[in-house]
């Protein structure tokens, strides 16, 4: 911390300009009025201050606003935002999407920092839900943002916001997250026709139940193998060979290359071998002809 010393004669800052880069830390502390700094924050970003000088400027703002900065200052923090701690940010009340964008721009190209995570958390909590515009903004800066949320947090995403989601935004989502997002996507896209609907819903299908996959198999969707491999194993297992053949269309041939991987491996084990043989792909491991299949889970439930 810089000790308090009187400002040398003639050095009192009348505005925030480049002459301040020639000030020593103690001179900045003594000669720059915090209220002036707050009203001219936008100028700070165009001046190549050292990190040490920025520390002094931050200290001055902290003294002026011990309860947290007003949004008029936050919006113009620019690269001074990188000096803020999560504790500082928790004191803020950020309501404007423009403010959020301005601060995300500063961190652009970098991993999501604890500061940014705290900022987003404060912003979303303030809004009460992840509306479409917010989601649009966040996924533009951080494509993996959606998948960083817990299923509980995702439950606050309204179906209307799903329109903002791009396939790459879901790349790192796990099944628990897709379980929450899929019903929202289904609701969001429900008024679309078959082929358009499938294009939109495709990246969410990792959360689809068996009955929805059965329904899709009746619509000539030609699901690709990459999508099929991301489906829930428990949703795939009850599908018949005929249903999988209809679901995949011409892509059914790809099953052979994936026969050792889930969910294909587990699905093969549940099918009758003679049904698998009808595909003509040489898939092996099905239930031999003449064997009786007992559903042990059903038996356990009865006993």
């Amino acid at each position: 911390e810089v000790e308090k010393t009187a400002c040398p004669s003639g050095k009192k800052a009348r505005e925030i300009d480049e002459s301040l880069i020639f000030y020593k830390k103690w001179e900045l502390e003594a000669c720059v009025d915090a209220a002036l700094l707050a009203t001219q924050m936008d100028r700070v970003n165009a001046i190549p201050f050292t990190y040490e000088q920025l520390d002094v400027l931050k200290h001055k703002l902290d003294e002026l606003y011990p309860q947290g900065y007003p949004e008029s200052v936050i919006q113009h923090l620019g690269y001074l935002f990188l000096k803020m701690s999560p504790e500082d940010i928790r004191k803020w009340n950020v309501t404007s999407l423009e403010t959020l964008k301005a601060l995300l721009e500063v961190n652009k190209g970098h991993e999501m920092s604890p500061q940014v995570a705290t900022l987003i958390d404060r912003f979303v909590k303030g809004r009460g839900q992840l509306d479409k515009d917010t989601l649009d903004t966040l996924t533009a800066f951080y494509p993996g943002y959606l998948c960083s949320l817990s299923p509980e947090e995702l439950s606050s995403v309204p179906p209307s916001s799903i329109w903002a989601v791009r396939p790459q935004d879901l790349d790192t989502c796990d099944p628990r997250q897709l379980d929450v997002l899929y019903p929202k996507a289904r609701l969001a896209f429900q008024n679309m026709n078959g082929s358009e609907y499938f294009v939109k819903i495709q990246s969410f299908l990792g959360g689809a139940p068996t009955e929805d996959l059965k329904a899709l198999s009746q619509q000539n969707v030609s699901m690709d193998l990459a999508t099929f491999m991301k489906l829930r194993t428990d949703a795939v297992l009850p599908l018949t060979v005929a249903e999988v053949q209809k679901l995949l269309g011409p892509h059914v041939e790809g099953l052979k290359a994936e026969e050792r991987h889930r969910p294909v491996r587990d699905w093969i084990l549940r099918q009758r071998q003679d049904d698998l043989d009808t595909l003509g792909l040489g898939l092996q491991g099905g239930i031999p002809n003449g064997y009786l299949v007992l559903d042990l889970s059903m038996q356990e439930a009865l006993s």
């Epitope: 165009a46 001046i47 620019g78 301005a102 721009e105």
Partner: nanobody
Amino acid sequence: LQLVESGGGLVQPGGSLRLSCAASGFTLDYYAIGWFRQAPGKEREGVSYISSSGGSTNYADSVKGRFSISRDNAKNTVYLQMNSLKPEDTGVYSCAAAGGYGNSSRHWGQGTSVTVS
């Protein structure tokens, strides 16, 4: 995205050096540039400044009349011409860029060493 300084070295008092600050990975056109120096055990201090357009320059009192800053946007480089060097000019000189799109970017170089002895 980085700034690379060069041109430092050992020079006798009264001699001259020209330092360069070159940007790689981004264009300097929209950035204001500052030259700073840090002598061993001392606080880093501002030496010179040039605006993004090149129309405005400024200098620390200790170097006025001896140092001159200029920029060549075509070469993506800013220069610091240092004449009549003194032993107290010794230090590591680094450049910083501030501004860019939305005034939200800044970059620092690693520095180049100047010894006047």
